[in-house]
């Protein structure tokens, strides 16, 4: 054999973010020579599950009929062929929502913002949480994390945007999470519609003042300005 077996592809349907109680199917796709598929879950005894391949043998199905906290986590899969086991797949992170009650999302000073001005999205939780996530519907890279350091929990996180352009307009939600598992998220906040008025030919925001360079709405940089408002919170882009 010229080299190691190619790694399989791992994915989840209908997606990798699943509400509590809903069903999810994990698929592992290898090669036609596969005789067996194995799914491993990080921090669980291996193998987490084994399945025989479905015809024509190049993939296997791992079914979760009702999503609970136990299923949330990081998975990898392998397949066995007559010459041995494959390399592990890239990891799949299966996230469960509904672990905690929903936070409240608001915009300061207002969800109606003029292009070129600043707006801050504020995600608030009535109980202390250590991670807040802001997502934008239909964004290519929707997740922005603010995570507290040293286990110091917070009731809120601020997501500043400046300068605002037309690409920042849209529907946002936020989630919150406790430190004992980043794969367990709250129910989503009620949606917040951010409406940007002004020229449709807004200049793209310059990344020179960014605290962190990363993909924001529709791959436009979402520019956090200034320092993180709560000293215990650290900014993460994912």
């Amino acid at each position: 054999q010229a080299g190691p077996l190619p790694k399989p592809t791992l994915w989840a349907e209908p997606g990798s973010v699943i509400s509590w109680g809903n069903s999810v199917t994990i698929w592992c796709q290898g090669t036609l020579e596969a005789r067996e598929y194995r799914l491993d879950k990080e921090e669980s005894p291996a193998p987490w599950d084994r399945q025989n391949p479905l015809e024509p043998k190049n993939k296997a199905r791992f079914s979760i009929p009702s999503m609970t906290e136990d299923y949330a986590g990081r998975y990898r899969c392998y397949y066995r062929s007559p010459v041995g086991w494959s390399q592990p797949s890239d990891p799949l992170e299966l996230v469960m929502t509904g672990a905690y009650s929903k936070p409240t999302l608001s915009a300061l000073p207002s969800p109606l913002v003029t292009s070129g001005k600043s707006v801050t999205l504020l995600c608030q939780s009535r109980s202390p949480m250590d991670t807040f996530l802001l997502i934008k519907e239909r964004a290519a890279h929707p997740l922005l994390h603010l995570r507290s350091e040293h286990g110091a929990q917070q009731h809120q996180a601020e997501f500043p945007m400046s300068p605002v352009t037309s690409v920042h307009g849209g529907t946002y939600r936020c989630f919150s999470s406790h430190g004992f598992s980043h794969y367990l998220l709250s129910h989503p906040s009620d949606p917040l519609e951010l409406i940007v008025s002004g020229s449709l030919e807004d200049p793209r925001p310059s990344p020179t003042r960014s605290v962190s360079t990363a993909a924001g709405p529709e791959d436009q940089p979402l520019m956090p300005t200034g320092s993180v408002p709560h000293s215990g919170l650290r900014r993460h882009w994912e």
């Epitope: 906290e69 929903k102 009535r126 406790h178 367990l184």
Partner: antibody, heavy 120, light 110 residues
Framework: EVQLVESGGGLVQPGGSLRLSCAAS?????????ISWVRQAPGKGLEWIGS?????????YYATWVKGRFTISRDNSKNTLYLQMNSLRAEDTAVYYC???????????WGQGTLVTVSS | DIQMTQSPSTLSASVGDRVTITCRAS??????LAWYQQKPGKAPKLLIY???TLASGVPSRFSGSGSGTEFTLTISSLQPDDFATYYC????????????FGGGTKVEIK
């Protein structure tokens, strides 16, 4: 009709235990709410006992004075919340309410209350 | 810990009077403050949430104001049905709290 109904109150001796129930109707306890237990001793003010998050993890927080004597739990299949009270003392005599925290973070729905009397 | 201090504890007033009750938080609670009315033998009733928003069905003579640490409940013209005890409450839930309610203000007939 959306309501909370407490039950399980009564007379109990000092040192005894009691379990109160709070049955929800018209909404699901597994929706995105917090539910709190609040008590009111005769002629006194409202006193927060603790709260449980309706999310699947069911996080609970208690007032500092509870010190492990009371436990809040829930049974989603019965849409019911519980308050287990142990090592009861005369000063625990009160009307006990369950109440729902709405989206506005206020207690927007209250039960009618159930009276617990601790006396020998 | 967040302590809620309500004043006065008792208030004597007449029908038609303008009544103001104050609630002070020991640290900022932003606008997460609610006011309740309670009558003897009854459960509390939500009057105002988020410091100034009137709950459904509450008469417009009730109003709330404030943010941060200082909040007030005002009854613009006291009616016979308003003689009751009023409580403030902050909206946070965590494990270092003694109580989430203020001590109460009893509004009685002068």
């Amino acid at each position: 009709e959306v309501q909370l109904v407490e039950s399980g109150g009564g007379l109990v001796q000092p040192g005894g235990s009691l379990r109160l129930s709070c049955a929800a109707s018209g909404f699901s306890l597994s929706s995105s709410y917090w539910i709190s237990w609040v008590r009111q001793a005769p002629g006194k003010g409202l006193e927060w006992i603790g709260s449980i998050d309706s999310g699947s993890v069911g996080i609970t927080y208690y007032a500092t004075w509870v010190k492990g004597r009371f436990t809040i739990s829930r049974d989603n299949s019965k849409n019911t919340l519980y308050l287990q009270m142990n090592s009861l003392r005369a000063e625990d005599t009160a009307v006990y309410y369950c109440a729902r925290h709405g989206d506005n973070w206020a207690l927007d729905l209250w039960g009618q209350g159930t009276l617990v009397t601790v006396s020998s | 810990d967040i302590q809620m201090t309500q004043s006065p504890s008792t208030l004597s007033a007449s029908v038609g009077d303008r009544v103001t009750i104050t609630c002070r938080a020991s640290q900022s609670i932003v606008s997460w403050l609610a006011w309740y009315q309670q009558k003897p033998g009854k459960a509390p009733k939500l009057l105002i949430y988020k410091a100034s928003t009137l709950a459904s069905g509450v008469p417009s003579r009730f109003s709330g104001s404030g943010s941060g640490t200082e909040f007030t409940l005002t009854i613009s013209s006291l009616q016979p049905d308003d003689f009751a005890t009023y409580y403030c409450q902050h909206g946070y839930i965590r494990g270092d709290l003694d109580n989430v309610f203020g001590g109460g203000t009893k509004v009685e007939i002068k």
